[in-house]
């Protein structure tokens, strides 16, 4: 129910968090979900579990899977499971999709470039940071603590910037890397109060029972690069991500930028196997920016199956 | 960040039943964490009541199990005290409180309860 | 249940000197090497706040000047130095099992 995504390449070091959230000291059990296999604590093994992390040094394609863990206490029990999968690496410079951290907006103003689950990690400075594939040189670029400055942004300097460190664990090293895109804020661009295209407000989608359903939110925010802009699917005014059904499920979908030069944002709310009780929910596509935040509310109705008896 | 916020009558007359809500925002109740009953007695004593945990199990202090009920609306975020024939040494401040297995952690202001006819 | 002796019932403690709570649990509140002791504290109109968890370990947030120590039966707060602000009552609390209880709390006062 509780579950986090994470990934990472083959021969490079991975550190999980449980994605239940507990204090340091805290008691947590790791365990290999389809075996319900004990994860050892033991340090000489290659995966091990340390208190609220579980380490891979170094990652193999074949831990892939999910993992649980169980932040345990005399009293009560609390379960997250923690999905992870280890990618081969790439040999052209290409970066795929499923390996990208969230994307980061700049501007001349602040051009920081955070490193993603460095803060995982036993490292040590400097970091070194590629710009699709090539070594960062010169003085405009400065590696600083966890994060990448760079001096007098232009728009070439949008593209995908990798971070690689070593993580050092009982003086043994490993190796790490992770790749975000960086876009810059376009100074010709603006941006308006949000408008959502889809769906309608009040629009009521039929739906049948036991079929999949999918809701798109769709929304435009201005033109040209927005700097915060985000449309997200609540239920009953709960994030999906705290709503805590594992059927119901929100993915992001393209950005879009229409010939007009509006930038556009999607989210599909998935709806695995529809039941009776999703209809009573309230659906609420949400777009929000710096201006504001519009909401569209949806509710499901039942569609009958055709009748294709004559 | 998480916030809680007790609401209840104020007043309650002895025998008959006490209710109080506890509201959750910027947290879900169904995502994780025990969500607690706690008072505190006009001498300052602090006595743990029962919870209703994210997956809807619940715990109570045998010393109330037969008066008390612990109970959730998972739409509105928010769960509920039921406290049977109430004497006026219930009279108290009601707390409710996270639990994450070790600790509590948030806590709401309080809501002062007296019984008294 | 799990009884929580606090002592002393309250204490009067100059500024920059050391302050000492002790709780005394009815039976081991410590399992598989965790010991399932809580502090809080608490000012006059709020609610109780966590101080120290696991018996030793400093919640986020709270000044260095606090800690915690103690297994099995018997625990000790500590506060040096104390400071104006450290004026309020201290309670002791378990969760080795249910129910949950509390200590009877320590006033303290600032001379």
């Known amino acids: 129910k509780f579950s986090k995504q994470s990934w990472g390449l083959e021969n490079e070091a991975l550190i999980v968090r449980c994605p239940r959230q507990g204090k340091p000291s805290y008691t947590v059990d790791w365990y290999y979900s389809q075996t319900n296999k004990s994860i050892p604590t033991q340090e000489r093994n290659r995966v091990f579990a340390s208190g609220q992390l579980l380490k891979f040094l170094p990652a193999a394609v074949a831990d892939s899977g999910i993992y649980t863990c169980i932040v345990r206490s005399p009293t009560f029990n609390r379960t997250g499971y923690a999905n992870v999968t280890i990618y081969k690496k790439q040999s052209d410079c290409n970066v795929p999709d499923y390996l990208m951290y969230s994307t980061v907006s700049g501007s001349e103003k602040n051009s920081k470039i955070y490193c993603p689950t460095i803060d995982l990690y036993n490292w040590t400075a400097p970091l070194e940071w590629f710009k699709n594939c090539q070594a960062l040189q010169g003085s405009r670029y400065r590696a600083h603590k966890s994060f990448l400055v760079i001096d007098n942004v232009m728009t070439e300097d949008a593209g995908d910037y990798t971070c690689k460190f070593i993580h050092n664990e009982n003086g043994a090293n490993y190796s790490v890397t992770a790749t975000r895109s960086f876009t810059v804020k376009d100074e010709q661009g603006f941006s308006l109060f949000p408008v959502i295209g889809a769906p309608a407000q009040n629009e009521i989608k039929e739906v049948e029972i036991g079929k999949n359903a999918n809701l798109t939110c769709s929304a435009c925010f201005g033109k040209g690069t927005q700097f915060l802009a985000a449309v997200l699917w609540q239920l009953n005014g709960t994030k999906i991500t705290d709503f805590g059904e594992p059927r119901i499920q929100q993915e992001e979908g393209q950005n879009q930028s229409f010939s007009n030069g509006l930038a556009c944002l999607d989210m599909v709310l998935r709806i695995a196997d529809v039941k009776e009780e999703d209809l009573l929910l309230q659906y609420d596509c949400l777009a929000l920016n710096l201006h504001g935040l519009r909401r569209h509310t949806v509710r499901l109705s039942r569609k009958n199956p055709i009748d294709h008896h004559s | 960040e998480v916030q809680l916020q007790e609401s209840g009558p104020g007043l309650v007359k002895p025998s008959q039943s006490l209710s109080l809500t506890c509201t959750v925002t910027?947290?879900?109740?169904?995502?994780?964490?025990?969500w607690n009953w706690i008072r505190q007695f006009p001498g300052s004593k602090l006595e743990w009541m029962g919870f209703?945990?994210?997956?809807?199990?619940?715990s109570f202090n045998p010393s109330l199990k037969s008066r008390i009920s612990v109970t959730r609306d998972t739409s509105k975020n928010q769960f509920f005290l039921q406290l049977n024939s109430v004497t006026t040494e219930d009279t108290a401040t009601y707390y409710c409180a996270s639990y994450d297995g070790y600790s509590f952690d948030y806590w709401g202001q309080g809501t002062t309860l007296t019984v008294s006819s | 249940d799990i009884v929580l002796t606090q002592s002393p019932a309250s204490l009067a403690i100059s500024l920059g000197q050391r302050a000492t709570i002790s709780c005394r649990a009815s039976?081991?509140?410590?399992?598989?090497?965790?010991?399932?002791m809580f502090w809080y504290q608490q000012k006059p109109g709020q609610p109780p706040k966590l101080l120290i968890y696991l018996a030793s370990n400093l919640e986020s947030g709270v000044p260095a000047r606090f800690s915690g120590s103690g297994s099995g039966t018997d625990f000790t707060l500590n506060i040096h130095p104390v400071e104006e602000e450290d004026a309020a009552a201290y309670y002791c609390q378990h969760s080795r099992e249910i129910p949950y209880t509390f200590g009877g709390g320590t006033k303290l006062e600032i001379k």
């Open positions: 039976k081991s509140v410590s399992t598989s090497g965790s010991s399932y």
């Open positions: 209703i945990s994210y997956s809807g199990d619940t």
């Open positions: 910027g947290f879900s109740i169904t995502s994780d964490y025990a």
